[in-house]
Structure formats: C-alpha cells, structure tokens
Interface confidence: medium
C-alpha cells in the first residue's frame, strides 16, 4: 500500500506569452498521495471552476484560458493540497501579446496656415508599438516644426501650404504592423491680394480696366465696390489658375471714383477679407490753370448762363481739344454733384464753380484768365458751404477721395490771389456781394479761434465771420 506523500510540483509554472483571442495554457504537474486538490488564482484571486472563460482539466493540473483578452494579463498560481504536509504553490505570469492596433485613428483636418495642427494616432499593442507617419508615399521626417508625440499623434507647428496632403500613421511591433486609413490635411490660407488695382487719370468717356489678383485657400471670391456701391457682375471678367483669382473690372469713365477690390474666402464659419483700392480721376477735372494757353470768348453755354455776367468774356483753355464743349461738360457733371448740397450752399457753390471753370478774361496779346479772389472762395468754404466742405475734407482724410475736393473742380482757396494785394488781379463773385446784405440770416461759423472779418469784402455794414488766418491784409 502506498505511503502518503505531500504534494510536490514537478513542473513549476512558467511565463506564458499569448496573443489576444488565442488560447493560453498553464501546466501544473503535481506528484502526491493521495491525489491533491488543485486550485488556481489570478493576481491572488481564486478562479471559479464554473467561469466559462477557463477550462481546468487533468485533475486541475491544466488551466486553459480559452480566448485571451488584454485584461487576462497577470500572475497565475496553482495551489496543491492533499492534507499531507502543507499546501504547495507555483506561480507564473501571463503576458498578453498584442499585434498593434490603432484605437484612435487620425481624421481629416482643415487648418489655417500658421496655426498648429495635431493628427491623433493612439495605439495599443504589446510590445508597445512604435508609431511613424507617412505623407503621400514617403516616410515623414521629423524636424523643428514636425514631431511625433509620445502618444503617437503628429504635431505640426506653424502649418505651411506645403504640409497639405494625405497622411497615415503606422503602428509597428514584433508581432505585426497596423496602418490607419489615409486622411487629408487641408491647409487654408487667408485671402491676400497679390496685385492691387492701379489708379488712373483719364479723359472723360475713356474706357479703363481695373485688375485685381488675389490668392487664398479656398480660392477667394472677388467683388468690386464703386464709391461705396456694389458693382454689377456683368462688367467683371474672372479667371482662376493655381488658386489665384484674377478679376478685371471694365469701366466707362464719366465721373471720378474710388474703386475697391475685396477678396474674401471662408474658413469654417468665419471669413477672411483683403481689400485694395484705386482711384479713377478725370484729367480735365484737376488741370491747373497756371500758364495755360487759351482764348477769350463770350460764354455760349447753358449751365452757367444765369451765374456769369451777361456778355462777359471768359477764358477757354486750349489744352482741351474742344475747350468750350469740354469746360461745359465739366461744369455739367459738377452740377449733378451739387444736387445733394443745402439750399444755402448750392447757389454760392454754383457761383464759385462757374467763375472758376469760366474765368473772367482780359483779352490782350496773351489772353489771361482772372482767378477768383481768395476772400470770396473762403466765404463759400467757411460760410455758405462750411458743413459740406467739412464733410468733403473728412472724406479726403479717410482716404476716400484723392485731393480734398471730393468730386468737384473746386479751387484751392489758399492758392488764389487776395483782392487786397491787387483788386484788378482777381474776380469777385457778385452773388456773394448781394447775399452779404442779408448775412444775419445765415448760421454763424464756430471756430476754435476768435472770429474776424474778411477785410473789405466789398464795403458793407456786414461781414463774414471766418478765422483770422484768412484775413489777408
């Protein structure tokens, strides 16, 4: 008869490597008499015999994990006890090995140039996979801007246009390699004007094409503004090549204007905009009368008929092809601009403009025009049209109009001769002399300086209140 024998584990447990979803087996061979009771623990917790994930055979000597999971990692021990002597134990580790798996793959990204982009790539695997990235067909090299983070994510600082493309991450360990799907990195670029429209100085009735070129991703749209109003698309020709949009605005010039090219593109819910402006001026509107050659003739036009002295000889500038027509056309266009001014300003401005464009003339060997007297010009500026003049100059300061004179052929008062230097060298405005009699009905002008009279503006009991800088004594 056999003698009782305490249990001895003849094959100690070893470390077992197992792949996820595969079978893992621990062998615990025991010699003893009587036959021992064998129990199993995982991380010191008893494995229940009825747990369907395990199979225990050969009198408990064989533990099989039927489908290994990540969480099965740990220390497995078999404990043998037959009542003879003490219980014996042998332990071994289960190392769950795992082919690389990408748990958080990268996704398509749209990013604005200059910002930071992060493409995620979170992985699982045992041994821990190494992560690399492919752009297009080539391995991506890290540099000062581009780095693969510990997590596997790809970080790109200061994103550039050339970073755009298709990316995938690659997770690799000794058991295999996993690839993410291809994702697209799109780099968006704020709209930027490459070529601004050029300003033009042209003759009335000329044709001008303004050109504006812009770049951006997505390709911007270009719109045009004429003196604050949108321009109809019928006159705009556009072409797009290599993300550059070229827009040409065709114009027929009948009045000066400010034309603004606006390039816009959209980034998500936000828009980026770039602007450039050009002025189109009409050459004849700003021509200096200085040293100009011309002839003296009776005014035969219509616009200034009621303003100019009857049968007066006026100066016609032969630098125009057809001086009488050209000057009449200028005053006619100016008249349209005056439609918006106040009833106080309009007749004074009409008197000023007519006498400026059709200057009184003393025909001699060389016909000479007589400019308006400075004091009368200032009276219009500072008194009759003070509000309009201020608004006009405000627009000029904000860059809305070239020269401070808005769209009218207005003289620069400071450059005109004073009637006190030589009363015969300049022209008075009879309308202002007449109106001056009722000056008390006009609003006074507030000035930061004390008010003073314009001296000797044809003798009268009343005077114009303007600042002393204009008292040209």
């Amino acid at each position: 008869e056999k003698l009782p024998k305490a249990p001895v584990i003849t094959t100690p447990l070893e470390t077992v490597d197992a792949l996820v979803e595969e079978v893992a087996t621990f062998m615990c061979a025991v010699e003893s008499y009587p036959q021992p009771e064998i129990s199993w623990t995982r991380n010191k917790i008893l494995i229940k015999l009825f747990d369907t994930r395990y199979s225990i055979r050969e009198n408990g000597q064989l533990l099989t994990i039927l489908s290994v999971e990540d969480s099965d990692d740990g220390i497995y021990c078999c404990i043998a006890n037959n009542g003879v002597g003490g219980a014996v134990e042998s332990c071994g580790a289960l190392q769950v090995k795992m082919k690389p798996k990408i748990t958080r793959p990268p996704i398509n990204v749209k990013i604005i140039e200059g910002l930071k982009a992060v493409l995620p790539c979170t992985t699982m695997g045992n041994p821990k996979p190494s992560v690399s990235w492919i752009k297009g067909d080539n391995a991506l090299r890290e540099n000062s801007r581009i780095a693969v983070l510990e997590s596997g994510s790809l970080r790109i600082h200061n994103v550039q246009k050339e970073d755009a493309g298709q990316y995938r991450c690659v997770a690799k360990n000794s058991l295999g390699t996993a690839y993410s799907k291809l994702v697209k990195l799109e780099v968006e670029v704020f709209a930027r004007i490459l070529r601004a429209p050029e300003s033009h100085n042209v003759t009335f009735g000329s044709f001008v094409t303004l050109r504006c070129t812009a770049i951006g991703i997505p390709v911007p749209t270009i719109s045009w503004i004429e003196n604050g109003n949108a321009v109809s698309s019928g006159s705009i020709q556009e072409s797009v090549k290599d993300r550059v949009i070229d827009s040409r605005l065709q114009l027929f010039i009948t009045k000066p204007g400010l034309y603004t090219c606006i390039a816009t593109n959209k980034h998500g819910e936000k828009f980026s905009t770039a602007k450039a402006a050009a002025t189109v001026s009409i050459a004849e509107w700003s021509k200096s009368q200085k040293d100009s050659q011309g002839y003296c003739a009776q005014y035969r036009g219509e616009v200034c008929d009621a303003v100019l002295a009857k049968d007066a000889l006026v100066f016609f500038n032969t630098s125009y092809r057809d001086p009488e027509d050209a000057q009449e056309l200028l005053i006619h266009t100016a008249w349209n601009e005056l439609k918006a001014v106040s009833p106080l300003c309009r007749p004074a401005a009409e008197a000023l403009l007519c006498n400026h464009l059709f200057q009184e003339c003393s025909p001699g060997v060389v016909p000479t025009p007589m400019p308006i007297c400075r004091e009368y010009c200032l009276a219009v500026k500072e008194l009759f049209c003070a509000k309009e003049w201020q608004a006009m100059e405000g627009k000029a300061h904000r860059g809305l109009y070239r020269s401070g004179m808005h769209l009218l052929p207005v003289p620069e008062c400071s450059k005109l001769p004073s009637m006190h230097r030589d009363p015969t060298a300049c022209t008075r405005l009879p309308y202002l002399d007449y109106k001056k009699e009722n000056i008390t009905t006009f609003p006074s002008i507030t000035s930061s300086r004390p008010s003073a009279d314009i001296p000797n503006l044809p003798a009268s009991t009343s005077s114009f209140a303007v600042s002393p800088a204009y008292s040209m004594t």
Partner: antibody, heavy 121, light 107 residues
Framework: QVQVQESGPGLVKPSQTLSLTCTVS??????????WSWIRQPPGKGLEWMGV???????YYSPSLKSRTSISRDTSKNQFSLHLSSVTPDDTAVYYC?????????????WGQGTQVTVSS | SYELTQSPSVSVALRQTAKITCGGN??????VQWYQQKPGQAPMLVIY???RRPSGIPERFTGSNSGNTATLTITGAQAEDEADYYC??????????FGGGTHLTVL
C-alpha cells in the same frame, strides 16, 4: 466730318458666325476722344447696344451677348469689325456702327446708314 | 444691365409741347442722351449730357434729368418731329443701355 459705313453679307445661315466691318473716314479710330460701337435693331424693335472698341483697342461687350461677341480692329485700314458666333434667326436685324465721342458725353454722334442682316437657312 | 423704361407712344398736336420720359433707378445721377430715328434712317443724336444740344438741332428740343426720370421736351412740335425717340445711358461699367423707344405722333 467723320463718316462710318457698315459692310458685310446680308444673309447668314443659323449656327454660323456673322462678320461685319465698319470703315471710318474723316477721322482715326485711334483718336483718344472716341470709341466705336456696334448697335443693332431687330425688325420693328428698339436699339440694342452690342459692344465697343476704345481708342486703345480695349473691348467691352453687352453682358447678354458677351459669350458670342467679338470686336476687333485694323488700324492700317481704319476699320473695326464685329463677329457674332452661333447666330439664330433672333439675330436678324439692321446692324449699325457708330462713333461715341467724349466731346458729347460719349454719345453716339455719327452713325452708319445700317446694314440689313437676315439669319435664315 | 440698367433698365430704362419709355412709354411706347406719345401724341402731340402740331405746335404743342410734347414730353417723352425715360425712367430708370436714380437716373438723375447719370448722363442721358436722346436719339431721334425716322423710318428707314439711322438714329440721330438730339440731346446729350441730359440737356445739351448738338449743333444743328433746333432749339425746340430740350432735355432735363433728375431723380428717377429724364425728360425730352419738344416745344412747338413740328410735323417733321414725328419719329421714334430713344434714351440712352452709359453704365459706369462699360456697357450702354437704350430705352425701348417712344413713337411720337404729331397730330
């Protein structure tokens, strides 16, 4: 005194290109103050501006005809031409060439007598 | 394109005043031309820049333009004034537009 005169075929088949020439005498088509337009008038209807060539050769077209219209010039002959592609019977009209002058607010101050063009197969 | 509206016909008694209108959005800010066209003839410029007459055009033809309406006035209409009249503007964007035309009948 400037004179303008249209010339070209009186009959054009549908889908073909209509070509007309305007000869200018008494003034140059490159003179700075002038532009040269084509204007047509379908039978019993009003005037329709088609396009213009400016003194510097730049061209501008009516938005409704832009895709089919082309205007060119031959400065050596002092002529400018209209080409209208893919014509249909709706293009049957009297075609005028006219001068636009900066001296008269770019109005058309000189007109040709007009040439009748019929589009029919 | 810019829409110009003209009434199709206007009648006037001989030597009376005829008014032909041309409507357009804020036309007062544009330069309006008027052309006269008699049957079988090319159009002829009668008014430019709203109210100016080319040389050779009788003084009875006058023009005005403000707000949304330009007007051609023929004071003391003559039999020879019976014709079609067209208004015309240039858009700032290099395209010209004509009104549909008004036939003036002198009774």
């Amino acid at each position: 005194q400037v004179q303008v005169q249209e010339s070209g075929p009186g009959l054009v088949k549908p889908s073909q290109t209509l070509s007309l020439t305007c000869t200018v005498s008494g003034g140059s088509i490159t003179a700075r103050y002038y532009s040269w337009s084509w204007i047509r008038q379908p039978p019993g209807k009003g005037l329709e501006w088609m396009g213009v060539i400016a003194y510097d050769g730049s061209t501008y077209y009516s938005p409704s005809l832009k895709s089919r219209t082309s205007i060119s010039r031959d400065t050596s002959k002092n002529q400018f031409s209209l080409h209208l592609s893919s014509v249909t019977p709706d293009d049957t009209a009297v075609y005028y060439c006219a001068r636009g002058s900066s001296r008269v607010a770019a109005a058309f101050d000189s007109w040709g007598q007009g040439t009748q063009v019929t589009v029919s197969s | 394109s810019y829409e110009l509206t003209q009434s199709p016909s206007v009648s006037v008694a001989l030597r009376q005043t005829a008014k032909i209108t041309c409507g357009g959005n804020r036309i007062g800010g544009k330069s309006v031309q008027w052309y006269q066209q008699k049957p079988g003839q090319a159009p002829m410029l009668v008014i430019y820049a709203d109210s100016r007459r080319p040389s050779g055009i009788p003084e009875r033809f006058t023009g005005s333009n403000s707000g949304n309406t330009a007007t051609l006035t023929i004071t003391g209409a003559q039999a020879e004034d019976e014709a079609d009249y067209y208004c015309h503007v240039w858009g700032s964007t290099a395209s010209a537009d004509f009104g549909g035309g008004t036939h003036l009948t002198v009774l």
